[in-house]
Interface confidence: medium
């Protein structure tokens, strides 16, 4: 770890951070934030992670210094730099992968003072699912589809008007391996559904959760999917 | 509102291919199955077969298999069937109709395709 | 494939009365889910078909009281209750219980 900048005569500033999830494969986002100061060339900022003896990122004198980066990190790191300004000290790190999960550190100097907050980045893969109906099966079938998900999620089917109905019975859920043997498609098929009524196909695993609804009656069919980031809480 | 728009009538010689065009508006296209239906001058409908907008699979009824192509660009939302090796029996008027769970619930004007030397 | 057979092929209407069309299949439209998948359909003259009934007895969205839809099994059948002006043409029964999916060969309904 490391901290060697106990200035004397320095106060301690306000560092801000948000417990996050990262999708693997793809962008993340470290948020941080912290009192601004009025000279860019003032701030310092030193992301780390515990359990990793470089610096995961450095930006100091308006530019990056990536001189002490581990190489787990290196070319997958970036600051928003015409943001820290304004007092955004947040990292964009590239391609996700399973490893970069831990407890990463938000470090700040500026003339004002210093300090500091940790954040726990969890990673995994989510997606959107999309429910259709299933042409293919028989007719009151509801199929419902997600492309990448890990770790394994849950899979629970709710329906407006049978509200509290246990589905377990009346669906079928498979988990099929995706090529990189890490994430996994979701599929979830809905046997015996009723017109005029809305289904809900939610899948959810300790970082994500996500509903696919499609609302079913005789003379249209309409769909929509939403996904929330579980366990986003500030420190 | 929901209509399927489809393209004009044609004159083919024996032999010949023909592509007919459904072009679908006012609702997700891939929400629904698009079907293709066979009306032959003073009878009744045959069904052709469909295509699952979603996935592209097609499925075609037995009488046409070998000679239809069904396929779909969802850009534009408009679904296709050609048919091809035309014979004097495939004169009549093509329709599009979207498929809703059991039912066709919305169906194109037609289109009517004439097969003569 | 599943034969659909309507009868009759031609049905004569006063404005006003009540007309009955049946429909017969060569084998059980039961679904082995426990649905019958058994539609009518009505083409005007010079128009494509509209969904009328689905499903034996559903009457579909904007679709008048006075058409009706009965039956089970092989044996269904469409019941106008009076008929008016507006309901001249083929009607068709169909079925999408078994693929492929089939149709009646059409009762042509027209006014006396």
């Known amino acids: 770890l490391i901290i060697g900048f106990g200035i004397s005569g320095r106060h301690s500033i306000t560092v801000t951070t948000v417990a996050s999830a990262g999708n693997i494969g793809e962008d993340g986002i470290l948020s941080c934030t912290f009192e601004p100061d009025i000279k860019l060339s003032d701030i310092v900022i030193q992301w780390l992670k515990e359990g990793v003896l470089g610096l995961v990122h450095e930006f100091k004198e308006g530019k990056d210094e990536l001189s002490e980066q581990d190489e787990m990190f290196r070319g997958r790191t970036a600051v928003f730099a015409d943001q820290v300004i304004v007092g955004n000290a947040s990292l964009r790190l590239k391609n996700v992968q399973l490893t970069d999960a831990g407890t990463y550190k938000c470090y700040i100097i500026t003339s004002k003072g210093k300090g500091n907050a940790n954040l726990e980045y969890k990673t995994g893969a989510f997606s959107m699912p999309e429910v259709n109906v299933d042409y293919n099966a028989s007719s009151e079938t509801l199929r419902c589809e997600a492309p990448r998900w890990f770790p394994q999620p849950t899979v629970v089917w709710a329906s407006q008007v049978d509200q509290g109905a246990n589905f377990s019975e009346v669906s079928n859920t498979s988990f099929e391996l995706n090529s990189e043997n890490v994430t996994m498609k979701v599929v979830s098929v809905l046997y015996n559904v009723t017109i005029n009524n809305t289904y809900s196909c939610m899948i959810e695993n300790d970082i994500a959760k996500a509903t696919g609804d499609i609302k079913v009656t005789e003379s249209e069919i309409k769909r929509r999917s939403h996904l929330q980031l579980l366990n986003s809480k500030a420190s | 509102q929901v209509q399927l728009v489809q393209s004009g009538a044609e004159v083919k010689k024996p032999g010949a291919s023909v592509k007919v065009s459904c072009k679908a508006s006012?609702?997700?296209?891939?929400?629904?199955?698009m079907n293709w239906v066979k009306q032959a001058p003073g009878q009744g409908l045959e069904w052709m077969g469909w295509i699952d907008t979603y996935s592209g699979v097609p499925t075609y009824a037995d009488d046409f298999k070998g000679r239809v192509t069904m396929t779909r660009d969802t850009s534009i939302s408009t679904a296709y069937m050609e048919l091809s090796r035309l014979r004097s029996d495939d004169t009549a008027v093509y329709f599009c109709?979207?498929?809703?769970?059991?039912?066709?619930?919305?169906w194109g004007a037609g289109t009517t395709v004439t097969v003569s030397s | 494939d599943v034969v659909m057979t309507q009868s009759p092929l031609s049905l004569p209407v006063t404005l006003g009365q009540p007309a009955s069309i049946s429909c017969r299949s060569s084998?059980?439209?039961?679904?082995?889910?426990?649905?019958?998948?058994l539609h009518w359909y009505l083409q005007r003259p010079g128009q494509s078909p509209r969904l009328l009934i689905y499903?034996?007895?559903n009457r579909f969205s904007g679709v008048p009281d006075r058409f009706s839809g009965s039956g089970s099994g092989t044996d269904f059948t469409l019941k106008i209750s009076r008929v008016e002006a507006e309901d001249v043409g083929v009607y068709f029964c169909s079925q999408s219980t078994h693929v492929p999916w089939t149709f009646g060969g059409g009762t042509k309904v027209e006014i006396k």
């Open positions: 006012g609702y997700p296209f891939t929400t629904y199955g």
């Open positions: 109709a979207r498929r809703s769970f059991w039912y066709f619930d919305v």
């Open positions: 499903k034996v007895s």
């Open positions: 084998q059980s439209l039961v679904h082995s889910n426990a649905n019958t998948y």
